[in-house]
């Protein structure tokens, strides 16, 4: 029988009974957090042969071997992994051996066997026979091999029963326990599995089979299982399911989901039956079982129980990540924060529709509303008192609503209200009226012309650039001297510049009132000579990089209650010149014959221009005399190098460190101090262990029900 989807056995060992009739676990198997040591000898699940995802064992007291529990577990498919691992054995205090003597294949993922203080028979298993790649295996902090004395069956009686393989240059017997060998198939089978009698299975079998060359006799399938047969691909009108079997449309349509949003059920996409459409796709209608590509970001409807969602911090904005339609009202009240504009854009930038009203008040940290970069419709289904669906009150630093040249925003119902926004020009508000279709809805007091924009230079003239010169890391620009009606009102200029790979930046990108700004700023004093045009040299730039640049005149903003004119330029895009590229990366060379070298490399990290060709130079080197110094047929003549064994937590020093053989010369020698690279590697290793342990704890600990 198929069990699943995923089985979690915790706290009570008697829950193991749930595995009684399982032949395949469709999903994962967790056995964990059983703190009372029990006698597991009466529990045996010989029917279980396949786990389609992963096996996780964590803190199960009293369990000494897995061999009695799962004598016939043959394949762990690793269709979904636990932090890149298909087999995790972690902090199993009493486990003495793994003992999964029928485990022949871990199809995907690596293994992690860590912090099992009593666990032996790890060096006797050749994982390369089970996994495709062993380089990602992590076997650390278990019982030191020296204390284990692992013996394979028959070695004591000098009648060894197990086969030998080479691991790390050690040719040795391979076994799971003191009485179970590791099964190996004849070399004639190649990658194929084999029966107990060493006959080769059908190519579509995986792990083992009950009869040779028969695709209906497989213990598990290499690709897919359908109607008792192992097949390379699912037949027409059937669909892949959970990475291992083929099901028909009716089966897929009748899967019930525990998700509370399950109104539509599973879908069929790209020949697979799956719970949801994959990223970038959406159902073709609410009751459809098929997916179509989304136009732009896929819609995600978010709803606020209390109707109004207050955004007063990055944390509250985080709840809206990925939302494209917000059912309810948005109240934005951002008084302070770090890097607030880009954080808000990250979490709210996909919102396209708000069904209720939008209210922005006391948001002194905001300079612009451009973080709502995809907002195109405010429905106004719910409105504030006075029938307002867009309400902007007392935002001391708000200067821009949106870039109206590139923005289409409709307010379907309700009015707008603006008051006490001293840096927001009334012209910006009037522009919003035009774009949103609300012109004529507002009454006279809804847009206050006295207290909006009274601390801004609102009527802007355009500054024109007169010349630009570039080198590989510099840009020189000049612009027309700006002449306001009274020259004393002009204080200086500010030049803003930043890297801009695309020509789509706006003045307020990444800018907030708390100091965060994605633009670099340089102040430029007025040239003393009235006939000289102001300009600047921008230096320390990157070669072959496009920059966006604009200039603003810094003017006195109030002259006896009249708004005076300011001035700024359009955004200019300018690219620095090309330069010499950095060196090519990861150069590797290998010989594939006596007269050829194959050289490979990766492009430079800083091309500093368009790369057109590479130059490869080579020269003959004299042969290294070291190669002739030893007779490599004589084992004794090879210099011995001793490597650390990499166990963690405990460093045992049992030998005199001064008696080591160093560099081929006998004599007393201290262990070399660790290099910076080694120290860094150890630090990264410790960090990696912590990250995994946090992931494990976060994944498996759930709060007790109230």
């Amino acid at each position: 029988e198929i069990c699943g989807p995923g089985i979690d056995i915790r706290n009570d060992y008697q829950q193991l009974k749930r595995l009684e009739n399982c032949t395949v676990i469709e999903g994962y198997l967790h056995i964990l957090l059983i703190s009372k040591a029990e006698d597991y000898r009466s529990y045996r699940f010989p029917k279980l042969t396949v786990i389609t995802e992963y096996l996780l064992l964590f803190r199960v007291a009293g369990l000494e071997s897995l061999g009695d529990l799962f004598p016939n577990l043959t394949v762990i498919r690793g269709w979904k992994l636990f932090y890149n691992y298909a087999l995790v054995i972690f902090e199993m205090t009493n486990l003495k051996d793994i003992g999964l003597y029928n485990l022949r294949n871990i199809t995907r993922g690596a293994i992690r066997i860590e912090k099992n203080a009593d666990l032996c028979y790890l060096s006797t298993v050749d994982w390369s026979l089970i996994l495709d790649a062993v380089s990602n295996n992590y076997i650390v902090g278990n019982k030191p091999p020296k204390e284990c004395g692992d013996l394979c069956p028959g070695t004591m009686e000098e009648k060894p029963m197990c086969e030998k393989t080479t691991i790390n240059n050690e040719y040795n017997y391979r076994c799971w326990t003191t009485n179970r060998c590791q099964k190996m198939c004849p070399s004639t089978c190649g990658k194929r599995a084999c029966t107990e009698n060493n006959e080769c299975c059908h190519p579509e079998c995986l792990g083992s089979c009950s009869a040779p060359d028969n695709d209906t006799a497989c213990v598990a399938c290499r690709h897919y299982y359908y109607a008792g047969v192992c097949v390379p691909a699912c037949p027409p009108n059937t669909y892949r399911f959970e990475g291992w079997r083929c099901v028909d449309r009716d089966f897929c349509a009748n899967i019930l989901s525990a998700e509370s949003s399950d109104s539509e059920g599973f879908v069929i996409h790209d020949g697979e039956c799956m719970q949801e459409c994959p990223s970038g796709f959406i159902r073709n209608g609410s009751q459809s079982m098929y997916c179509i590509p989304c136009e732009g970001p896929c819609p995600k409807v978010c709803e606020e129980e209390k109707k109004t969602k207050t955004i007063d911090s990055v944390t509250s904005a985080q709840m809206l990540q990925g939302c494209t339609i917000f059912k309810g009202n948005l109240l934005i009240n951002i008084r302070r924060g770090n890097n607030i504009a880009s954080e808000l854009e990250n979490f709210m930038g996909l919102i396209e529709v708000v069904t209720g009203y939008v209210k922005i008040r006391h948001s002194h940290a905001l300079v612009s509303l451009s973080f709502l970069k995809n907002l195109r419709l405010i429905l106004g289904e719910e409105q504030l008192e006075g029938n307002y669906s867009f309400y902007v009150l007392d935002n001391q630093n708000l200067q821009q609503l949106w870039d109206w040249d590139h923005r289409n925003l409709t307010i379907k119902a309700g009015k707008m209200y603006f008051a006490f926004n001293p840096k927001l020009c009334v012209s910006e508000i009037y522009r919003m009226e035009e774009v949103t279709g609300t012109k004529g809805r507002q009454s006279k007091g809804d847009i206050n012309t006295r207290n909006n924009g009274e601390r801004a230079s609102c009527e802007s003239d355009v500054l024109h650039f007169t010349s630009t010169t570039t080198s590989k890391n510099r840009i020189i620009i000049t612009w027309h001297r700006y002449r306001p009606p009274d020259y004393r009102d002009l204080i200086s200029f500010t030049v803003y510049y930043k890297e801009a790979p695309f020509k789509n930046v706006t003045e307020y990108d990444g800018q907030d009132a708390c100091g965060s700004n994605s633009w670099n700023m340089v102040d430029v004093d007025l040239p003393p000579n009235k006939d000289v045009e102001p300009g600047i040299l921008l230096h320390g730039l990157k070669p072959w990089t496009q920059y966006a640049v604009y200039v603003k005149a810094v003017t006195l903003t109030m002259v006896e209650n009249d708004h005076i004119r300011g001035a700024k330029s359009e955004i200019l895009y300018i690219r620095t010149n090309a330069s010499v590229p950095s060196i090519p990366l990861d150069v590797l060379s290998a010989s594939n014959s006596s007269s050829q070298l194959i050289v490979k490399w990766n492009p430079p990290s800083l091309p500093n221009g368009n790369l057109s060709y590479y130059i490869v130079r080579w020269q003959r080197q004299p042969q290294d005399g070291y190669l002739y110094r030893h007779n490599y047929c004589s084992k004794d003549k090879i210099p011995i190098r001793k490597y650390a064994d990499g166990t963690i937590d405990i460093e045992e020093v049992t030998e005199n460190p001064k008696t080591e053989v160093c560099g081929g010369e006998k004599g007393p020698c201290c262990a070399c101090p660790k290099t910076e690279a080694e120290k860094q590697a150890e630090k990264e290793e410790a960090e990696y262990r912590k990250v995994f342990e946090n992931f494990l704890h976060n994944s498996i600990f759930v709060p007790r029900p109230e």
């Epitope: 699943g4 899967i255 019930l256 525990a258 399950d262 059920g265």
Partner: nanobody
Framework: EVQLVESGGGLVQPGGSLRLSCAAS????????MAWFRQAPGKGLEFVSA????????RYADSVKGRFTISRDNSKNTLYLQMNSLRAEDTAVYYC????????????????WGQGTLVTVSS
């Protein structure tokens, strides 16, 4: 862990109706697919009906289609089975079961089970 307790069983005449309930404790029921199974005297376990976590989708065995209705009240953590037009062959012990994530049509090994309630249809 999840504890399930069935109630509502009893003796009923052919053609009559009965409503079974299954109360859950230990976890919120809304995060499970819920199902009813039955076991007639001397027979194997038989699937009756199942319902999705939201309660919007359900599935029935052919033998009960049109007569039985499964429903759930997640706020009360309770599953129901309304049985109408009962027949003698509906006599069985009815079990309530719960499974996380999802339940395929061929799944009989649900994660959690109740103790069962006996329904007898006889004149």
């Amino acid at each position: 862990e999840v504890q399930l307790v069935e109630s509502g069983g009893g003796l009923v005449q052919p053609g009559g109706s009965l409503r079974l309930s299954c109360a859950a404790s230990g976890r919120t029921l809304s995060s499970f697919v819920m199902a009813w199974f039955r076991q007639a005297p001397g027979k194997g376990l038989e699937f009756v009906s199942a319902i999705s976590g939201s309660g919007l989708r359900a599935r029935y065995a052919d033998s009960v289609k049109g007569r039985f209705t499964i429903s759930r009240d997640n706020s009360k953590n309770t599953l129901y089975l309304q049985m109408n037009s009962l027949r003698a062959e509906d006599t069985a012990v009815y079990y309530c079961a719960a499974n996380p994530r999802y339940a395929t049509p061929d799944l009989t090994q649900y994660a959690y089970w109740g103790q069962g309630t006996l329904v007898t249809v006889s004149s």
